[in-house]
């Protein structure tokens, strides 16, 4: 449906507001380091263009592209190459190439101050001296440091911040209101972030078929009772809706998936029987609850795929004369009859049968050659449920803290040149996957978990790409994104490395350590414990643990002291030596 | 706690039948699919016949079509295995199983297993 002027179609069909905001994240997650009000200047600047064109698509400009008007209005930007360097070297291309340069120089992990919470009283003050500047900041602040964050779903989360401010600044006890709310969205959302960060990462570096492929295990799994035709066709349309939004063009991405849950919604008689109450709702809402809607019942009976894929004598033939859709059936009839495997094992399982008849539909006798191929399932059904069974022991014995500090060490042992700052943060998040997914009876522990940590493992992989210092890293991020979660677990000790040199300085520790939150206290502990495996990669787990516990307790003895800083410099030099001591240092 | 509890097993002459049959307790019998399985002595253990949940559709190995005929009963939390024509190679410890989702009547799919019913098969 051709239109003579795309950014007044667009107009048209968000409506204002909306397209404010989807151009400001635009524009945020492009140029992350540009100030707040440059920002708003180039929207309003966009905006008021959008709306002569609305009033005469025929006007000057109207007919361009938006990748052409928005990278010129990026373009313009003064400062651009003092602040950004060779990005600015992209304006000099001519679009589509533009627009890939500005998507090339993403930081997903950009120079940004952390994000520091103000007082409620002067939080409130701001929202209700303007309150939709301070959305905007909100918009605005999080897009910048997460430059692949879902657009449409952040219209959401700006929708719910606000909803939050507007009941507790109001409340007898604002904070009281207002912070775990705070808390709860920041959660979510960094969450939500890391999970399209996945889905971005599987479009760019493993192309459409590898994300729909995924789309196709999950639907079906989400979907169990409607037809694969049905399934194939919300997978076409959802592969463009995110293709889209990780490609930066926010205004069709939003449009196109307020399309998809319209239609969803209105067919959904023959796509799922959990989806009334969330066609009630409004279209953010509705959107991300069809996103996060639970697993429909599976059909009262289904038979064995045997019948289908192994016994039939048609099998080589149905897969020469098309082998995805036929490959995609496969998959499809799999993982509506198992809501209990992770998305990625149903696509392991898929790429062996593959494997199999592409070997054996050449063979003499291609039956005979793949009779027995659901029986090569076994091992790799196996193994991630023995992994998980051993990992939720370990969890539940140990509390997530002291979890999290044995993935640590694990990971450190694994991969020790990569910086402790991502390690802290990627086994922080792995060793969050006990108390997510392990209090989940035994049919949902799988896909809770393996997803979770395909999840975090790319987090690992994005920013490793960055700055990659590990060949172990860069081979099991790029060989295969359904075999990174089994490649980084066979990784063992890494022999090669050559142990980090001592450095009294990363063990100082000043009084400052006191005021911090239970969070901040035991990152610091655990940066100090990667670095400890840094310094002695042999060191075994008790000898870590006492140097831990000895850490542990000159902390809360110096807390309790009166002169605390003398405190952290005396007992902090004792306790460098007995550290050393005790590791052999 | 999910029991599964086999019976019928027994010495039979080679051509003669036996009727097995598996009591279900501590589930909720109609969400699973059932099946049977068979280890000879030194053997693996090797699926022999599932039938899904309504009972509506069964798959069975090779080796047993045409002789073998599995069938459940959901009002009596019940699974049958009826064995007819039967050839001393089918000498084994029969044990029952119950799998909550179930694609392709593998082994590894099953949640919950019988202790087994002993058939010899003589010639």
């Known amino acids: 449906d051709a239109h003579k002027s795309e950014v007044a179609h667009r107009f048209k069909d968000l409506g204002e507001e909306n397209f404010k905001a989807l151009v400001l994240i635009a524009f945020a997650q492009y140029l992350q380091q540009c100030p707040f009000e440059d920002h708003v200047k180039l929207v309003n600047e966009v905006t008021e263009f959008a709306k002569t064109c609305v009033a005469d698509e025929s006007a000057e400009n109207c007919d361009k592209s938006l990748h052409t008007l928005f990278g010129d209005k990026l373009c313009t930007v003064a400062t651009l190459r003092e602040t950004y360097g060779e990005m600015a070297d992209c304006c000099a291309k001519q679009e589509p190439e533009r627009n890939e340069c500005f998507l090339q120089h993403k930081d997903d992990n950009p120079n940004l101050p952390r994000l520091v919470r103000p007082e409620v009283d002067v939080m409130c003050t701001a929202f209700h001296d303007n309150e939709e500047t301070f959305l905007k900041k909100y918009l605005y602040e999080i897009a910048r440091r997460h430059p692949y964050f879902y657009a449409p779903e952040l219209l959401f989360f700006a929708k719910r911040y606000k909803a939050a401010f507007t009941e507790c600044c109001q409340a007898a006890d604002k904070a009281a209101c207002l912070l775990p709310k705070l808390d709860e969205l920041r959660d979510e959302g960094k969450a939500s972030s890391a999970k399209q960060r996945l889905k971005c990462a599987s479009l760019q570096k493993f192309g459409e078929r590898a994300f729909k492929a995924w789309a196709v295990a999950r639907l079906s799994q989400r979907f169990p009772k409607a037809e694969f035709a049905e399934v194939s066709k919300l997978v076409t349309d959802l592969t463009k809706v995110h293709t889209e939004c990780c490609h930066g063009d926010l205004l069709e991405c939003a449009d196109d998936r307020a399309d998809l849950a319209k239609y969803i919604c209105e067919n959904q008689d023959s796509i799922s029987s959990k989806l009334k109450e969330c066609c009630e709702k409004p279209l953010l809402e509705k959107s991300h609850c069809i996103a996060e809607v639970e697993n429909d019942e599976m059909p009262a009976d289904l038979p064995s795929l045997a019948a289908d894929f192994v016994e039939s004598k048609d099998v080589c033939k149905n897969y020469a004369e098309a082998k995805d859709v036929f490959l995609g059936m496969f998959l499809y009839e799999y993982a509506r009859r198992h809501p209990d495997y992770s998305v990625v094992l149903l696509l392991r399982l898929a790429k062996t049968y593959e494997t199999t008849l592409e070997k054996c539909c050449a063979a003499a006798d291609p039956h005979e050659c793949y009779a027995k191929v659901f029986d090569e399932f076994k091992p790799l059904v196996e193994e991630p449920q023995n992994l998980i069974k051993q990992n939720c022991e370990l969890f539940e014995q140990l509390g997530e803290y002291k979890f999290q500090n044995a993935l640590l060490v694990r990971y450190t042992k694994k991969v020790p040149q990569v910086s402790t700052p991502t390690l802290v943060e990627v086994s922080r998040n792995l060793g969050k996957v006990g108390s997510k997914c392990c209090k989940h009876p035994e049919a949902k522990r799988m896909p809770c978990a393996e997803d979770y940590l395909s999840v975090v493992l790319n987090q690992l992989c994005v920013l490793h790409e960055k700055t990659p210092v590990s060949d172990r890293v860069t081979k099991c991020c790029t060989e295969s994104l359904v075999n990174r979660r089994p490649c980084f677990s066979a990784l063992e000790v890494d022999e090669t490395y050559v142990p980090k040199e001592f450095n009294a300085e990363t063990f100082t520790f000043h009084a400052d350590i006191c005021t911090l939150s239970e969070k901040e206290r035991q990152i610091k502990k655990q940066t100090a414990l990667v670095e400890l495996v840094k310094h002695k990669p042999k060191a075994t787990k008790e000898q870590l643990k006492a140097v831990m516990d000895d850490f542990a307790a000159f902390v809360e003895k110096c807390c309790k002291a009166d002169d605390k800083e003398t405190c952290f410099a005396e007992e902090g030099k004792k306790l460098v030596a007995a550290s050393q001591a005790a590791l052999g240092l | 706690d999910v029991q599964l509890v086999e019976s019928g097993g027994g010495v039979v002459q080679a051509g003669g039948s036996l009727r097995l049959s598996c009591a279900a307790s501590?589930?909720?019998?109609?969400?699973?699919?059932m099946g049977w399985f068979r280890q000879a002595p030194g053997k693996e253990r090797e699926r022999v016949v599932s039938?899904?949940?309504?009972?509506?559709?069964?798959y069975y190995a090779d080796s047993v079509k045409g002789r073998f005929t599995i069938s459940r009963d959901n009002a009596e939390n019940t699974v049958y295995l009826q064995m007819n024509s039967l050839k001393p190679e089918d000498t084994a410890l029969y044990y029952c199983?119950?799998?909550?989702?179930?694609?392709?009547?593998?082994?590894?799919?099953?949640?919950?297993w019988g202790q087994g019913t002993l058939v010899q098969v003589s010639s």
């Open positions: 501590g589930l909720t019998f109609s969400s699973y699919a």
């Open positions: 039938i899904s949940r309504g009972g509506g559709y069964t």
């Open positions: 199983a119950a799998a909550r989702y179930w694609a392709t009547g593998s082994e590894y799919e099953f949640d919950y």
